[in-house]
């Protein structure tokens, strides 16, 4: 799948409504220079791809943020601005439904969250440029 | 579907560098995010590095500022750069791609480092 037939202007106007807002909270008591981020996305399908990876994938620190709020309101943005994205997730939802529940430490995602608040911010600006 | 295989292990004393590389054949690769396992004797098979396909990575905090995962997708191979190895870095790394939509992961086989002097 990529996100090249997206609806980016509804994307961008549910993560300046909702998801950003939820990814801020998340982060809150932290500040911006807690973590020296230096993350890329070369157009807005490849930001798309690189925010879905560290949204509902694990990495080294940060077991899962799939139950988190602005996860959630990622996955019914993505599915309802990208056509064909909510077949892809079938299997994901069920393979979830069999792992057992980890608990998570939720200062150790916050690396990961920030990263992803860098991805979405570079979706706004590559979005910006091409209006 | 991709298939792994990993290389590049071998005995290297404390304080040694060595570059793991993990070889990907099939579709796929280019968008999946890729991760080096360790596991250690008795041990849990352990997540240390990760990296999208776009580049960002992440790491456990006992591998931080030692070791660095990066991917070349015109050539489907990842590598680990371990630099400072630790007695405590023992153990087999194997490589593993993580369909980013759907979470099917495939596996390489595994290449055994030990740090010994």
């Known amino acids: 799948y990529d996100f090249t037939n997206c609806d980016f202007q509804k994307i961008e106007a549910d993560y300046l409504r909702t998801i950003s807002k939820d990814l801020i909270t998340y982060m809150s008591g932290t500040k911006s220079t807690d973590f020296n981020n230096t993350v890329s996305c070369s157009n807005r399908p490849h930001c798309l791809t690189e925010i879905q990876s560290l949204t509902f994938n694990p990495t080294p620190r940060c077991a899962s943020l799939a139950k988190e709020m602005f996860a959630r309101k990622t996955k019914a943005t993505l599915a309802l601005w990208c056509p064909g994205y909510s077949e892809t997730q079938i299997n994901a939802t069920q393979a979830m439904k069999k792992r057992r529940k980890r608990k998570v430490t939720t200062n150790k995602c916050l690396e990961q969250v920030s990263q992803l608040l860098g991805l979405w911010r570079r979706f706004i600006r590559t979005l910006l440029k091409k209006q | 579907e991709v298939q792994l295989v990993e290389s590049g292990g071998g005995l290297v004393q404390p304080g040694g560098s060595l570059r793991l590389s993990c070889a990907a054949s099939g579709s796929g690769f280019g968008v999946n995010i890729l991760y080096w396992y360790r596991q250690a004797a008795g041990i849990e098979r352990e997540l240390i590095a990760s990296?999208?396909?776009?580049?960002?990575?992440n790491y456990v905090d006992s591998v931080k500022g030692r070791f660095t995962i990066s991917r070349d997708n015109s050539e489907n191979t990842m590598y680990l750069q371990m630099n400072s190895l630790r007695a405590e870095d023992t153990g087999v790394y194997y490589c593993?791609?993580?369909?980013?939509?759907?979470?099917?992961?495939?596996w390489g086989q595994g290449t055994l480092v030990t740090v010994s002097s």
């Open positions: 593993a791609s993580r369909n980013i939509f759907d979470g099917t992961t495939e």
């Open positions: 990296i999208t396909s776009g580049g960002i990575t």
